[in-house]
């Protein structure tokens, strides 16, 4: 009787998925860069700012070569999820003070959420270990003052920019291994 009928290609394969994930990450990187410029223009930073609750940078670009696909995707998802929470927190806690950064901050949050979903789907298609997309996390304390919130905004956008830059390099490298 011959082989059974096949299925038409219904959805993008993981390599195409990785391509579109890189494009989305690049676009988010540009959004973050523009938002950082806006923030510095409206609220100039006096040096570098840190926030203890932010993740430490996953890896230097030079050390990427030794990384494996599962560890890169797992770490990237965990870090981006933390940044998503921080952006949500920033918008809630600093709504009135940072209203000049809306709707850009809202767009950033939406795209970050979309990137996280894309990474989740990619990990599922590859059958890599799954992490809960919405793990419980301790609530972030409100900023002590308006200026404290602005310093936090500088730290969040600066850290997110570095993480996304690392992500683009990492994802491009991993594409060659898939």
């Amino acid at each position: 009787p011959g082989p059974p009928p096949g299925s038409p290609r219904a959805s993008p394969d993981p390599r195409a998925e990785l391509d579109s994930t890189v494009l989305l990450t690049r676009s988010l990187l540009e959004d973050t860069r523009q938002l950082t410029i806006q923030l510095k223009d409206k609220f100039p930073a006096d040096g570098d700012h840190n926030l203890d609750s932010l993740p430490t940078l996953a890896m230097s670009a030079g050390a990427l070569g030794a990384l494996q696909l599962p560890s890169v995707l797992t770490r990237l998802r965990a870090d981006l999820l933390s940044y998503l929470r921080h952006v949500q927190w920033l918008r809630r806690a600093m709504g009135s003070s940072l209203k000049t950064l809306e709707p850009e901050l809202g767009t950033l949050q939406t795209r970050l959420d979309r990137l996280l979903r894309r990474l989740q789907l990619l990990m599922s298609r590859l059958a890599l270990p799954q992490l809960p997309p919405d793990p419980p996390a301790p609530p972030l304390a409100p900023p002590s003052s308006t200026w404290g919130g602005i310093r936090a905004a500088h730290a969040i956008l600066g850290g997110l920019h570095l993480t996304l830059d690392w992500a683009v390099r990492g994802l491009l490298l991993l594409k060659t291994r898939l």
């Epitope: 959805s11 979903r117 599922s124 298609r125 059958a127 890599l128 799954q130």
Partner: antibody, heavy 114, light 112 residues
Framework: EVQLLESGGGLVQPGGSLRLSCAAS????????MHWVRQAPGKGLEWVSV????????YYADSVKGRFTISRDNSKNTLYLQMNSLRAEDTAVYYC???????WGQGTLVTVSS | QSVLTQPPSASGTPGQRVTISCTGS?????????VHWYQQLPGTAPKLLIY???ERPSGVPDRFSGSKSGTSASLAISGLRSEDEADYYC???????????FGGGTKLTVLG
């Protein structure tokens, strides 16, 4: 066109063994995690096992843990399921599936009976 | 018993809209994992209908849509047709099982 073709099913006695194969074509097999899912006659779908795109991660349903082994050969575009210590309750159509799963084969019937 | 709960049956007349629910828990849908839906026509293999809660694979008509909220998800079929008569299954990853879980399936009957 994506094609997944299972083989190796048949009638086997309780306690016996079978090895199922699934030949893949029409897509980049080595880029997809692969699953085995089964369906007992007249029943719903039950996930059996999954193996990551490169074979480094393998997970099993509790009902088959220690008895079934999933493996793959990316150079041959083939997925395998080694089934040992078979029981009557393992009787089902066994499907291989790729990705989420996005694509499914037509299935192969495994009957465990004395 | 399935980890994801679906009504065993659903029905509607041609042209109608029907909805099939899928209820999970904090270890699967409630943990934020995506829900996927499959259609199994009589005597055939399952086919992916909706992935990632609300994404349609190419070739699937826009009469089919999915949504998710909290620990539940639902599949909606509008403009019901006789060829939609099939079994429908939801699926999601489950932390406690370290693998995907399926709902028990819903048999959709198109009346008349």
């Amino acid at each position: 066109e994506v094609q997944l073709l299972e083989s190796g099913g048949g009638l086997v006695q309780p306690g016996g063994s079978l090895r199922l194969s699934c030949a893949a074509s029409g897509f980049t097999f080595s880029s997809y995690g692969m699953h085995w899912v089964r369906q007992a006659p007249g029943k719903g779908l039950e996930w059996v096992s999954v193996i990551s795109y490169d074979g480094s991660y393998k997970y099993y349903a509790d009902s088959v843990k220690g008895r079934f082994t999933i493996s793959r050969d990316n150079s041959k575009n083939t997925l395998y399921l080694q089934m040992n210590s078979l029981r009557a309750e393992d009787t089902a159509v066994y499907y291989c599936a790729a990705g989420v799963p996005d694509y499914w084969g037509q299935g192969t019937l495994v009957t465990v009976s004395s | 018993q399935s980890v994801l709960t679906q009504p065993p049956s659903a029905s509607g007349t041609p042209g109608q809209r029907v909805t099939i629910s899928c209820t999970g828990s904090s270890s699967n849908i409630g943990a934020g994992y995506d829900v996927h839906w499959y259609q199994q026509l009589p005597g055939t293999a399952p086919k992916l209908l909706i992935y990632s809660n609300n994404e349609r694979p190419s070739g699937v008509p826009d009469r089919f849509s999915g949504s998710k909220s909290g620990t539940s998800a639902s599949l909606a079929i509008s403009g019901l047709r006789s060829e939609d008569e099939a079994d429908y299954y939801c699926a999601a990853w489950d932390d406690s099982l370290n693998g995907p879980v399926f709902g028990g399936g819903t048999k959709l009957t198109v009346l008349g």
